[in-house]
């Protein structure tokens, strides 16, 4: 068990032209709140599919009224974290949807008026117990900055929160066959011992000493099959004489929860309470394996021997982390000589050399650039008897006096709009796409790219999605 925590840092206009109008006005003050939806695995499901790992709503933010004529600033945020508790293993791979909602505080009668301002989605790999991961996502003209982490609730530890730890009974070492719980070296891994005689096939336990039965089995040790002989038909009518109660059609009919999970109806769907070690909408997932494709960036997945993880990623050069999700900062080794600027391009390292130096690592000393001036921070380099200017990002031409257009190559996919920016370029994606270059569909497999209409809109109201 554990908690996924999300901290919203800012929500406001993104960089580039086309700043959005403030969502609030003097006539219609409003406040923001956020919703996070988590799903296990890396599936890019429709936004409306159930949040199998959990969902949470933030508190409402402070009331905000736009100052007339002022551009939309970063909007005031709710206090505190969004916390999504998870009961079982942390899957390691997950998809998220973060929605920014506006609550209008006009004088309408009855319930509040809600509308969806922005929705961002992503797929990430994250080990429980790790540091906060920072992220920036854009939705239309809006930009959301946030951090997230997953942490285990004691006594669970490990990257999936699957190991249990208890304080040591003896000061020197753990019991036979039990390991210390790094990083809690003063605690020991705790075995989960079910009630003696509990059927290993038909019973399980979530607490030491208990024996809970899978569907179809009963008795103190789950060794007795449930008899259905008193029912005339498994789908027959309810009978007061036989004591059989067969419900009509409903989401829990036939128990959609696998692996001994128990089903309860929610207002629009159903919820499975899963036994220890299982998670997912139907308790169908027992841990991330290589079949889930957990290794990023071309990492090679092999089955892991460590009980904490069902796989190990062997990372290609330039990447590290349990899922090869972190790019190694190869520039930290300072490979560029003579004060050259190191650029890690992923596939290769590049050195941008200071004036008077050249070569792949700026190892060649040149003195032919002494009388040459490169504008806008460009540096002069010589190679093959000629000298030229190596221009700073955003500039080009012989002397770096021409402003380069980073959008000329049409880098934004799927109809995204490109904006030049001091740090390069920014893509404003068309509805249904996301990513730095709009390369990822939000809703694949033909599902609608538009979110469902937000609640609280009356027929005929404009419905605008960013």
């Amino acid at each position: 068990a554990g908690v996924f925590e999300l901290q919203i840092h800012s929500f406001g206009p993104g960089p580039g032209p086309g700043a959005p109008r403030s969502p609030c006005s003097a006539r219609l003050p409003c406040r923001l709140f956020f919703r996070v939806c988590l799903k296990p695995g890396l599936s890019e499901e429709a936004a409306e599919s159930p949040c199998a790992l959990g969902a949470a709503l933030s508190a409402r933010g402070p009331v905000y009224t736009e100052q007339p004529g002022a551009p939309a600033p970063d909007l005031p945020l709710p206090d505190g974290l969004l916390q999504v508790p998870f009961r079982d293993a942390w899957p390691g791979t997950f998809s998220f949807i973060i929605e920014t909602w506006r609550e209008e505080l006009g004088d309408q009668i009855g319930g509040p008026a809600w509308s969806l301002l922005a929705r961002v989605a992503g797929r990430r790999r994250l080990a429980a117990g790790g540091p906060w991961a920072r992220d920036i996502q854009r939705a239309g003209a809006w930009e959301l900055r946030f951090s997230y982490r997953a942490r285990c609730e004691p006594p669970a530890v490990g990257t999936a929160c699957t190991r249990l730890c208890r304080p040591r009974s003896a000061p020197s070492r753990c019991g036979p066959g039990l390991r210390p719980c790094a990083p809690l070296e003063d605690e020991c891994e705790a075995p989960l011992v079910c009630r003696a005689g509990c059927s290993p096939e038909h019973g399980f336990c979530e607490q030491p000493g208990e024996c809970r039965c899978l569907e179809g089995w009963t008795g103190p040790l789950c060794t007795v099959p449930v008899s259905t002989s008193s029912c005339l038909s498994p789908r027959g009518p309810s009978s007061a004489t036989t004591g059989c109660l067969v419900p009509g059609p409903g989401p829990c009919d036939g128990n959609p929860c696998a692996n001994g999970g128990s089903c309860s109806e929610t207002p629009r769907s159903f919820e499975c309470t899963c036994p220890r070690g299982f998670y997912g909408l139907r308790c169908e997932v027992s841990g991330v394996t290589c079949a889930d494709g957990p290794c990023f960036n071309g990492g090679l997945c092999v089955g892991g021997a460590d009980p904490d993880s069902a796989y190990i990623c062997h990372c290609p050069p330039g990447f590290q982390g349990s899922n090869c999700e972190k790019r190694v900062d190869r520039c930290s080794l300072q490979p560029c000589r003579n004060g050259g600027l190191c650029l890690d391009l992923g596939h290769a390292l590049r050195c941008r050399c200071r004036a008077g130096f050249a070569g792949p690592r700026c190892e060649h000393d040149l003195d032919d650039c002494a009388g040459r001036a490169c504008a806008n921070g460009g540096t002069c380099v010589e190679g093959g008897g000629a000298h030229r200017c190596s221009c700073a990002l955003g500039f080009g031409g012989r002397d770096c006096r021409e402003r380069a257009d980073p959008c000329a190559a049409r880098p934004c996919a799927h109809g995204g709009r490109c904006y030049a920016h001091f740090s390069g370029l920014v893509c404003a994606c068309a509805p249904g796409y996301m990513g730095a270059r709009c390369e990822f569909p939000v809703h694949p497999d033909g599902a609608s790219a538009l979110p469902a209409a937000p609640p609280g809109l009356r027929p005929g109201d404009p419905q605008r999605y960013l």
Epitope: R35, C37, A55, G111, P112, R268, A452, A453, P455, R458
Partner: antibody, heavy 124, light 106 residues
């Protein structure tokens, strides 16, 4: 302006079937996120949720009354109908319909507008 | 079923008093909803999603809590606040209400 109004018989006999209609305005059951529910309140007692129906025809019934209840909607008429079979004097209550709003499959946001209720008496 | 237990069942207070009504759920619920009902009238939504004030509800009403224990607070009672208050959960079917708390004038 959002309004809901319940209509139906005020007196039914035991074993008969009760049919109640909720007619609403100001919102549409074709709008994503909208639902209508039925709640009852016996005289001097607490509220009891009976059933609800969503814009996409997802329905929920109280398990203790499931075999007796049917909820349907007519989106074009802005109406939701609840039928309750095999009425008994213990079913005497004021029956309310209310609008329900949901963000998603997991969270009901609010049951924010209610009709004024209709008192149904079950007696022979 | 998730049982909702309100306390107290009835309460006498004076105008200007601070009043707290609690609602305890028999198992974990994500959010709590509070309604006010006056004699012969339909219930009126006060608080949704545990702590959010419905439109038109005075700011003297507030809601808080998490897990199984939730609270409705009226910071300074007004004459129009004397009514019966109900809590409700939307976590799992049946979607149950509390038995009600009747707030009377002392």
């Amino acid at each position: 302006q959002i309004t809901l109004k319940e209509s139906g018989p005020t007196l039914v006999k035991p074993t008969q079937t009760l049919t109640l209609t909720c007619t609403f305005s100001g919102f549409s059951l074709s709008t994503s996120g909208m639902g209508v529910g039925w709640i009852r309140q016996p005289p001097g007692k607490a509220l009891e949720w009976l059933a609800h129906i969503w814009w996409d025809d997802v329905k929920r019934y109280s398990p203790s009354l499931k075999s007796r209840l049917t909820i349907t909607k007519d989106t074009s008429k802005n109406q939701v109908v609840l039928t309750m079979t095999n009425m008994d004097p213990v079913d005497t209550a004021t029956y309310y319909c209310a609008r329900i709003v949901s963000f998603d499959n997991d969270v009901v946001s609010a049951m924010d507008y209610w009709g004024q209720g209709t008192l149904v008496t079950v007696s022979s | 079923d998730i049982q909702m237990t309100q306390s107290p069942s009835s309460l006498s207070a004076s105008v200007g008093d601070r009043v707290t009504i609690t609602c305890s759920a028999s198992s974990h619920v994500s959010y709590m909803y509070w309604y006010q009902q006056k004699p012969g009238k339909a219930p009126k939504l006060l608080i949704y999603l545990t702590s959010n004030l419905a439109s038109g509800v005075p700011s003297r009403f507030s809601g808080s809590g998490s897990g199984t224990d939730f609270t409705l607070t009226i910071s300074s009672l007004q004459p129009e606040d004397f009514a019966t208050y109900y809590c409700q959960q939307w976590r799992s079917n049946p979607f149950t209400f509390g038995q009600g708390t009747k707030l009377e004038i002392k």
